[in-house]
Interface confidence: low
């Protein structure tokens, strides 16, 4: 008996061939004996099964000595052996109808969990198995459970039904919610203006919500709501924001602030959570701030930086064009008796310059000038 | 059964960009993943890289900064494009589609050769 | 990039005579999650397409004859033909689907003695 698997909601086209090639009678019947259709010369008939309004046939083919039978928006409760009586032959098609569907929606927050649920018809006895967009592969029976998703398991799953060594695919577009970075760092001198900005990494019709910027000072014992807004389709409205600082925010995604200067008491960490209309739980990111400031006291030169440095950056001041004066791995560095001349805060990783302050040191009678 | 017919310019100039487009027939061009293959005169089969109606695409990293894929379901056509190509980018060109078996390619266009020549 | 080998490169047939392609691959394409192997033979019959014969190691594609069939595990396997038909010449072709880029064997041109 040859067996055809289907999707639920699909089309399926059973075959049945005639060794004649041309029209002659036909019916196809379900496995209670019921017709579904057949043909009256060149007349497609109907019997009276549940499929009435969703089977049909080529009569295109007819000529040629096939007679196939049409099945549309195919139901699992489809799953049956339908005969094809033809030439005093019997063929017989076992069709099985699978459906497979995803727990609740399909767009999930990062870290919630995915269940696709798999449709069968009873006897049958299916495996699944699917495949992420990050190629991460789980097998199951009825429901498949991947917990924890990762913003790399936004995309299409594929998943392959197994059935009598024949396969079946259903694709599923999966969006995880999430911002496209987890974590982000900006470093600034005293008194530059600072850009954050938090980028999602889908894209939907409407979005709407609610968020925050909750931020820790280095300096500070606690942390504190530096501003909330909230979101309708796309458009962000502040609602609620410090006088210090005080933040100004884009009135379009992505979501920007900036921050008017870089000052040593605003270095530290933040994390923005965005709270979307019916999504439980948050979206977050974190974000850092590190602040350089290279000054000048009498005869002492110093750089300092505040803010989350890992402690293999390295601090260093040199004169420009030289080699450095004092390197180290600590938040303050300082030279006293400078000779004259440009002299540079480097902050570095690697060797990789991440931030860099520049002070002009005049001959001793003269004042320091910052460019 | 699902048929595909590759066309295209079978001549194209160096440092131009390969322009090809696959037309599927007997299925529709949202159920599948939608391949490029491609094998020089002679020579053994590469993969350029892949494309699903959702927009997300899989390429080869030896062409990744080359190579644009993209499908009109409109037209059930789907379509490769690679730009600055040079004398080794001459092959006959394959469009493939999975047909429900996972990853695996099982129909094939019958190919079209692209020659890049001045 | 996960590198294919094949042996022979060349293969004289006899009609009617067993034949037998081997496939390696350079990491395993088992994936340990799901305990399927990730290999497809194609077979490119002269001036045509190349052809899927079997898929995930083992299962035969709609309409190949049963006298192929795909064996193997981990990075070795093999692609038997029980008796070889004058048909069945062409180049064949090992390709994994396991990660990505999606990569081929060099072929195994089989031809009749």
């Known amino acids: 008996k040859k067996v055809v698997l289907g999707k639920k909601g699909d089309t399926v086209e059973l075959t049945c061939t005639a060794s004649q090639k041309k029209s002659i009678q036909f019916h196809w019947k379900n496995s209670n004996q019921i017709k579904i259709l057949g043909n009256q010369g060149s007349f497609l008939t109907k019997g009276p099964s549940k499929l009435n309004d969703r089977a049909d046939s080529r009569r295109s083919l007819w000529d040629q000595g096939n007679f196939p039978l049409i099945i549309k928006n195919l139901k699992i409760e489809d799953s049956d052996t339908y005969i094809c009586e033809v030439e005093d032959q019997k063929e017989e098609v076992q069709l099985l109808v699978f459906g497979l569907t995803a727990n609740s929606d399909t767009h999930l927050l990062q870290g919630q969990s995915l269940t696709l649920t798999l449709e069968s018809p009873p006897g049958s006895s299916p495996s699944v198995q699917c495949r992420s967009p990050r190629g991460k592969n789980i097998q199951g029976g009825k429901t498949l459970s991947v917990s924890q998703l990762e913003l790399q398991d936004s995309g299409t799953w594929t998943c392959t039904v197994l059935q009598n060594q024949k396969k079946v695919e259903f694709k599923i577009d999966i969006v995880v919610l999430a911002f496209q970075k987890a974590s982000s760092i900006v470093y600034k001198k005293e008194g530059e203006q600072v850009e954050f900005s938090f980028p999602l990494a889908f894209t939907v019709e409407k979005l709407t919500g609610s968020g925050e910027l909750w931020w820790q000072a280095e300096r500070a014992s606690s942390s504190k709501s530096w501003i909330t807004f909230d979101l309708k389709n796309k458009e962000v409205s502040v609602k609620r924001v410090t006088q210090d600082p005080k933040l100004q925010m884009g009135k379009k995604l992505p979501l920007h602030l900036t921050l008017p200067q870089a000052l040593p008491q605003y270095a530290g960490s933040g994390n923005l959570t965005l709270a979307l209309e019916a999504k439980t739980g948050k979206l977050h990111q974190e974000v850092n701030l590190v602040v350089m400031r290279a000054t000048q006291l009498q005869k002492n030169l110093t750089c300092e930086v505040w803010g989350p440095t890992s402690p293999k950056l390295m601090l260093s001041l040199k004169l420009e064009n030289k080699e450095a004066k004092v390197s180290k791995r600590e938040k303050a560095v300082w030279v006293l008796n400078p000779e004259a001349g440009m002299w540079q805060c480097l902050l570095s990783d690697s060797g990789q310059v991440l931030l860099e302050s520049n002070i002009k040191v005049l001959p001793t009678w003269s004042t320091p000038v910052q460019p | 059964q699902v048929q595909l017919q590759e066309s295209g310019p079978g001549l194209v100039k160096p440092s131009e960009t390969l322009s090809l487009t696959c037309t599927v027939s007997g299925g529709s061009i949202g159920s599948y993943y939608w391949s490029w293959i491609r094998q020089p005169a002679g020579k053994g089969l590469e993969w350029i890289g892949r494309?699903?109606?959702?927009?997300?695409?899989n390429y080869n990293p030896s062409l990744k900064s080359r190579v644009t894929m993209s499908f009109d379901t409109s037209k059930n056509q789907f379509s490769l494009k690679l730009n600055s190509v040079t004398a080794a980018d001459t092959a006959v060109y394959y469009c493939a589609t999975d047909g429900g078996v996972g990853d695996s390619l099982d129909y094939w266009g019958q190919g079209t050769l692209v020659t890049v020549s001045s | 990039d996960i590198v294919m080998t094949q042996t022979p490169l060349s293969l004289p047939v006899t009609p009617g005579e067993p034949a037998s392609i081997s496939c390696r691959s350079s990491q395993s394409l088992l994936d340990s999650d799901d305990g399927n192997t990730y290999l497809d033979w194609y077979l490119q019959k002269p001036g045509q397409s190349p052809q899927l014969l079997i898929y995930?190691?083992?299962y035969r594609a709609s309409g190949v004859p049963d006298r192929f069939s795909g064996s193997g595990s981990g990075t070795d396997f093999t692609l038997k033909i029980s008796r070889v038909e004058a048909e069945d010449v062409g180049v064949y072709y090992c390709m994994q689907h396991i990660e990505f880029p999606f990569t081929f064997g060099p072929g195994t041109k089989v031809d009749i003695k």
């Open positions: 494309i699903y109606t959702s927009g997300s695409t």
């Open positions: 995930t190691l083992s």
